[in-house]
Amino acid sequence: ECVTQLLKDTCFEGGDITTVFTPSAKYCQVVCTYHPRCLLFTFTAESPSEDPTRWFTCVLKDSVTETLPRVNRTAAISGYSFKQCSHQISACNKDIYVDLDMKGINYNSSVAKSAQECQERCTDDVHCHFFTYATRQFPSLEHRNICLLKHTQTGTPTRITKLDKVVSGFSLKSCALSNLACIRDIFPNTVFADSNIDSVMAPDAFVCGRICTHHPGCLFFTFFSQEWPKESQRNLCLLKTSESGLPSTRIKKSKALSGFSLQSCRHSIPVFCHSSFYHDTDFLGEELDIVAAKSHEACQKLCTNAVRCQFFTYTPAQASCNEGKGKCYLKLSSNGSPTKILHGRGGISGYTLRLCKMDNECTTKIKPRIVGGTASVRGEWPWQVTLHTTSPTQRHLCGGSIIGNQWILTAAHCFYGVESPKILRVYSGILNQSEIKEDTSFFGVQEIIIHDQYKMAESGYDIALLKLETTVNYTDSQRPICLPSKGDRNVIYTDCWVTGWGYRKLRDKIQNTLQKAKIPLVTNEECQKRYRGHKITHKMICAGYREGGKDACKGDSGGPLSCKHNEVWHLVGITSWGEGCAQRERPGVYTNVVEYVDWILEKTQAV
């Protein structure tokens, strides 16, 4: 069961896996959740009754029964990991800890104007896990305003001490706020010859890359495939680092693959969820249980539902044996990866899907789309919403995109003259406008947040957030789209679609069925040539065919320009403005979402 509350003055006895240092019990709970085996924890807060060397210790614990005996102890705070919970989990920690010095390897020291600037520096430094900043009130003159960037093997401090007039905090890489490049490419026949910080077994290079991503010290990796000549190294995933943050040497070697940590892309691609099945593959590890199961899918479900299960191997039933049920071996290991991977034994293996909730919901694969045609099918664009106004009569006003369970991203110009959110209704999971009747459920709007710098669409900043009165329950027909990663600024998107219920020509009416059109992106230089009277800024992105013919039109405003990249859909643009509709050499102009990721996160993550 899911227990989220913390138990004050309580200590769990036994079951210790390891001890780390965290600045709060809340963060200890997050560390426990992300640890492959931790189910419970005990944190020691600062207290006069407690030995200062034990302050801020976070003891990670495991138990076969998923619980441990409780003992009363002042200053101890205990709790359970969120592994047992079904809700979305994030490692993002924006808290700043006053008068705490988080110890680690101080590898960079520089002057910063503020703790925020220091945190930004840490977030944009590939090695940085956390920082300590000496404020301008710090007693030692030469250390004032000094920003120390730190890293450790575990990503958590090696110790935490009280120190007046300093503040500490963590890198915000896990909050999608890093400007570091997001390099998704996997390089075949390549070995990165840098120092290994760890090695694990993995079934393929993609899993290896995802493991590297959530390993605190891993910056890049090399994976030896099952065809690698040296048998003892087959399926070996080497997690690597270097001082520069980049591989120093690349060696051409057949049957090896290399790539980079996806820490700067983690909010727009799955990094925890290993959802594939590996046929004719056996995962070895500590056996947790052996259960009868009808299929490998059923076995994966059993593993996902067993909180301690990390991976599984399913052996299909021998003809008519055991009511056609095979054996499902539920397994675990100290690091969450198989201790060995064997091939040719007929097993089907895979991983728990419990970790998928640590990934952004937007990375979930949606059903295959129908190619060709202009009318969409149900569930094809599950993030698309229709925004209605009830004044003077109810009608479709604009499109919008679900980006969170309480948030719609749309265009600011949709709210021309709108004084109150009370007249707005958001309908999700809609294909045809005719589905909307008086009794159709909708989301009321609690707040309209328009970008402070917005004046008119053509001047830019044409972006707005709608905070919904109630939360959206994600289903196949209504789910979020990923925001682009800031590290993806240089990605060239080639599979982009504009969707909406807008006019199909200049003098027309709102369409009943959601329309779609594949439209190529146009460079800003090219776009500027087509709009001499306007300033096309880097905060705008353009899309259209030179000959015209396909474009957004009236009623499409606020809707998404969705681009598929590495199997994940990203909200690249918001339909904003254009000269006419689908005119020759007049591309549509869209709000360039990647330039507003900070603004979006600031508004949606505000307390």
């Epitope: 265009a411 110009h413 003259g417 807008g502 009236k554 405003s557 006419g580």
Partner: antibody, heavy 118, light 111 residues
Framework: QVTLKESGPGIVQPSQTLNLTCSFS??????????VSWIRQPSGKGLDWLAH???????RYNPSLMSRLTISKDTSRNQVFLMITSVDTADTATYYC??????????WGQGTLVTVSS | DIVLTQSPASLAVSLGQRATISCRAS??????????MNWFQQKPGQPPKLLIY???NLGSGVPARFSGSGSGTDFSLNIHPMEEDDTAMYFC?????????FGGGTKLELK
Amino acid sequence: QVTLKESGPGIVQPSQTLNLTCSFSGFSLSTSGMGVSWIRQPSGKGLDWLAHIYWDDDKRYNPSLMSRLTISKDTSRNQVFLMITSVDTADTATYYCARKGRGPFAYWGQGTLVTVSS
Amino acid sequence: DIVLTQSPASLAVSLGQRATISCRASESVDNYAISFMNWFQQKPGQPPKLLIYAASNLGSGVPARFSGSGSGTDFSLNIHPMEEDDTAMYFCQQDKEVPWTFGGGTKLELK
């Protein structure tokens, strides 16, 4: 509630500079999205938009009069000003200030009549 | 500049009847969501009063006998049923781009 009130000299001589003041209450020009425009109307004729000032001191002018117009504001005193240089009889009109947020001109002042005459 | 042409220049309508005023723009005043066309009423010695914004939305406190329609370049204001109090000048105005411009006006009288 929102109110705006224009004030001006009443009569101004040709080639002189006309200074107008718009005093308002019920809103602040430091609020994001807020702006105030000047619009004029010669007697018995149509309306001409002249200039607009935004909360962030960004300004817009009617290109046909741009060289003669200067709009400014004093946010703390809730006032917007318009200066028109080198006036002539064609500038005789009722001058209105109007509030424009992220929408239309929803609130107008009563207007002030300005006559250009020697 | 976007030029707005109103027609007719003047109009006389009987009590209870329908009055229709047209406004044509020299180029589209639509963007991908909104028709940036507004309508104002002005009585002698008074400032203009907002009637309709974004082509069809009623201004605050405006009676429901006023309605607006249109998109792109062609717009109209309808008053039905005509009342004595509706005798005034009516102006259309575009908010699509600077310079914001007004139509020449239509004088509505009681027949």
